[in-house]
């Protein structure tokens, strides 16, 4: 199917860099880099940086738990966040504080402002800052369902911890529901896990923004660190291009770096947006480790050579039993970026941008 | 990097078939096909077929939930099952029947017979046949921890159903624990989910092998359909080859079949073990849809052609922005097989055998 030539490493790198130029623009559905004429001077607004950092946190924790992604996730997602309604809102008076639960409510008009159509929502995460925890705590998350009933969503076993830590719950389905038919204010309940024969559990974990009900008072810590919904959605103008087939988020492995391997391996490539692409329009990050895959994947003719030594090579060189094995990315990671459209800063996440490992396929 | 030649479809198929010959032997760590001299005549034993079908059921439900797989999962796994200790065993007398729980105990000596070393265990599933259910039921699974305490493992929301259905819980970690330091008899508890403020829940679901405690009596249905542990493990003789790097199980997509697409796509290829490989030693299945990937993935030079039409091609032809995009499998599925070693039938599962979709990478 193909014949090998001597590899020109510089040409490979140039082709990879040029492919990335097109890839980024393609993911953002931009025909050309956006004009920088209206960009306000000075550093990025703090809120934008906070949002960018939230997205980076999400990326860091992501590769450990691969999950299916719709094809639509090829395209960049606009990232927004909606803070929990402050605890002096009357909605909180309707739900008596207890030793085993705390309540978090959200204004659906704010959600709809961020995501006008339910179908545009790609992912929604409930983010909670848990304070230092001295005992293991099993918690459950519920969704406000009808007036006074709660629907179980998920659970988490929280390990003891020496410092505060962000918790993230995937609530995509719930938020999609709220966007399509939610009331004015919708909410979640975080509760201690109670089994049918031990019901005296107390919610030991403190969530920033509350002191738990067992203390009787409900103190709000204002600002960025109270519970919020992190939303990733396709912008409305990009919506008509959605497709329904599926991509996957891969595993994070770095087994190849700093190796002298001649066969298929991941190779280091740092792309500086300004130097390599001549771009000033991406404000954060300044560049990223794109990397690329390179090296031969020999085909093994098993017919004439069926003995252990040759068969052992299959796992390395042709695990998928391909007719023409090829060195391709195995694990990819997303890249969040900050750029301006006119005077407006945008935080978007580009999927499958960083090659973490390669495989013969 | 490579130059294209006219594609000889027959050569591609032959190379794929021969690669599969080596792949199967390699996954089983066999230097050559096993001798069939001692294979007993007649059909496969019913227990072996039941086990094979359990494995096939597992495969069918699998691609919907991809999860990380250790590199060791490249190699075939031996599949066994251990039935729940019958309910007339005295262990059941120690745990009072209640309206909210049922108990299932297992003999660890049987587990150790199936899997001599904890490290060999690749996956363990608790399989329960739930009878038809007229109400939605939220259940929780617990593990027997010390004499009379129970550790929460997982939960499931069971939808109402008009017919019996197998439930499967991943209990790999628990069984691995039992293999290394378990008592003589270990067990699980299936309970109704109770929240801290609604504690009167009854276990409404009937599990084959019991009538739940609320009926007072405890009837055992003997045979294959009482709760069991489905175990997948590396056979002892194959253990020294385990590695720790990671592979992934992909998503199930079938978007390419019966398409006239000339570019990269999944192509149909059925392999009949007897006709195509001259093999009589695989007793089940008789063959399988291996399929393969074929078709060009053009590289796009974005530098000179930054306009929407060309950029739109990135998603299809070079989503990973590769310097030399290649048509490779995206979604792969495992294949369970039945074969004999001497007089002994074996059920083993071969990972990543069936190509469900392709991608340019």
């Amino acid at each position: 199917l193909s014949t090998c030539k001597t590899i020109d490493m510089e040409l490979v790198k140039r082709k990879r860099i040029e492919a990335i130029r097109g890839q980024i623009l393609s993911k953002l559905r931009l025909a050309s880099p956006p004009s920088q004429g209206e960009v306000p001077p000075g550093p990025l607004p703090e809120a934008v940086l906070a949002l960018y950092n939230s997205t980076r946190d999400r990326v860091a924790g992501e590769s450990a738990e691969p999950e299916p992604e719709p094809e639509a996730d090829y395209y960049a997602k606009e990232v927004t966040r909606v803070l929990m309604v402050e605890t002096h809102n009357e909605i909180y008076d309707k739900f008596k504080q207890s030793t085993h639960s705390i309540y978090m409510f959200f204004n659906t008009s704010e959600l709809r402002e961020a995501v006008p159509e339910p179908v545009l929502l790609s992912r929604a995460e409930l983010r909670l800052l848990r304070l230092k925890l001295k005992v293991e705590q099993h918690v459950e998350l519920y969704q406000k369902y009808s007036n006074n009933s709660w629907r179980y969503l998920s659970n988490r076993l929280l390990a003891p911890s020496d410092s505060p830590e962000w918790l993230s719950f995937d609530v995509t389905g719930v938020v999609r529901q709220w966007l399509s038919r939610g009331g004015e204010i919708e909410g979640f309940r975080l509760s201690a896990h109670c089994s049918c024969d031990s019901r005296d559990n107390t919610l030991q974990v403190d969530i920033n923004g509350f002191t738990t009900g067992r203390r009787g008072d409900l103190a709000t810590i204002h600002g960025m660190n109270r519970p919020f919904l992190l939303l990733m959605a396709t912008p409305l103008e990009r919506a008509q291009h959605l497709q329904s087939s599926r991509h996957r988020r891969a595993l994070d492995t770095n087994y190849c770096f700093s190796s002298t391997e001649k066969n298929c391996c991941v190779r280091q490539l740092y792309i500086d947006f300004r130097k390599d692409l001549g771009w000033k329009w991406i404000h954060e990050p300044k560049g990223y480790h794109a990397n690329f895959c390179l090296g031969p994947c020999p085909y093994i003719w098993s017919l004439d050579t069926q003995y252990s030594k040759v068969l052992a090579l299959y796992n390395q060189h042709n695990p998928g039993a391909s007719a023409a094995p090829c060195c391709v990315p195995q694990a990819l990671e997303p890249l969040p970026i900050v750029y301006y459209v006119g005077r407006k800063p945008k935080v978007e996440q580009l999927s499958n941008m960083i090659v973490r490992s390669c495989k013969c396929s | 990097l490579s130059t294209c030649k006219t594609i000889d479809m027959e050569l591609v198929k032959r190379k794929r078939i021969e690669a599969i010959r080596g792949q199967i032997l390699s996954k089983l760590r066999l230097a050559s096909p096993p001798s069939q001299g001692e294979v007993p005549p007649g059909p496969l034993p019913e227990a072996v077929l039941a086990l094979y079908n359990s494995t096939r059921d597992r495969v069918a439900g699998e691609s919907a939930e991809p999860e990380p797989e250790p590199e060791a999962d490249y190699y075939a796994k031996e599949v066994t099952r251990v039935l729940m200790v019958e309910t007339h065993n005295e262990i059941y007398d120690k745990f009072k029947q209640s309206t909210h729980s049922i108990y299932m105990f297992f003999n660890t000596s049987e587990l150790r017979e199936a899997v001599p070393e904890p490290v060999l265990l690749s996956r363990a599933e608790l399989r329960l046949l739930r009878l038809k259910l007229k109400v939605e039921q939220h259940v929780e699974l617990y593990q027997k921890y010390s004499n009379n305490s129970w550790r929460y493992l997982s939960n499931r929301l069971l939808a109402p159903s008009d017919s019996p259905e197998w439930l499967s819980f991943d209990v790999t970690g628990v069984v691995r624990q039992w293999l290394s330091r378990g008592g003589e008899i270990e067990g699980f508890r299936l309970s109704a989910h109770c929240s801290c403020d609604s504690r009167d829940n009854t276990l409404q679901v009937d599990i084959n092998g019991f009538t739940t405690g609320r009926r007072g009596d405890l009837a055992t249905i003997h045979g294959m359909n009482r709760p069991f542990l489905l175990l997948m493990a590396t056979p002892l003789e194959r253990a020294q080859h385990l590695q720790s790097s990671r592979h992934r199980r992909a998503l199930d997509t079938n978007y390419c079949f019966s398409s006239t697409e000339k570019n990269c796509c999944v192509r149909q290829l059925y392999i009949d073990f007897r006709k195509d490989l001259g093999w009589k030693w695989i007793h089940e299945p008789k063959g399988y849809h291996a399929n393969f990937c074929l078709g060009p993935c053009p590289y796009i030079w974005s530098l000179d052609t930054q306009y929407s039409k060309v950029l739109a091609l990135y998603n299809q032809h070079n989503p990973g922005a590769s310097a030399a995009p290649c048509c490779v499998p995206q979604a792969l599925e495992p294949l369970p097989i039945v074969y004999y070693v001497g007089r002994k039938p074996k059920v083993e599962q071969l990972s990543n055998m069936i190509v469900r979709s392709c991608k340019c990478s």
Epitope: L131, K132, L133, K134, V135, E136, T202, Q204, R215, A219 | -
Partner: antibody, heavy 116, light 110 residues
Amino acid sequence: VEESGGRLVTPGTPLTLTCTVSGFSLSNYAMTWVRQAPGKGLEWIGVIYAGGNTYYANWVNGRFTISKTSTTVDLKITSPTTEDTATYFCARDVGSSSSGVYFNIWGPGTLVTVSS
Amino acid sequence: AYDMTQTPASVEVAVGGTVTIKCQASQSIGSRLAWYQQKPGQPPKLLIYDASTLASGVSSRFKGSGSGTEFTLTISGVECADAATYYCQQDYSYRHVDNIFGGGTKVEIK
């Protein structure tokens, strides 16, 4: 809660202090070690949670190790220096009355003198 | 790091008077703060935890307030028995922390 094991040691001689508890279970409470040099303030060394997790002050750097049995909490000083001369206190957390770790039951302390 | 700074280092107060001790955290610690009293030759005694909750058996003359980075311990109707050194303690994080306790404030009675 009572500390023991404090004595005069020469620099570099390993020393283990023991905190013996009664009337409560260590599987339900976090325990801490705090020291106080003569005429100085309280200096936190580290904590062991009910579940066994241990956390140390930044400066500890492997010089101290906290461990426990069912009724004792040990503090091992791997290689004492003269700067480790102090009264060493062991204290128990308030337990489930707060999700924070605060210490409401303290031992009387045990004096460690490091001198050549 | 979450460093705790106490002011003043020492204070003199008349019997029946009121004394205010401040504790400042280098970063926000929410309300994860406790106050202790220590008398010479004795171990510390817990007075207040979670910034404002009075510990069991402690006189209501002791009052804790504040959240975030600024905290205050107020002793009203001071008695001779209140002569001691007072320490604050943060419980927000142990990571990269040199000391969870403040430097102490010595209260002397005139």
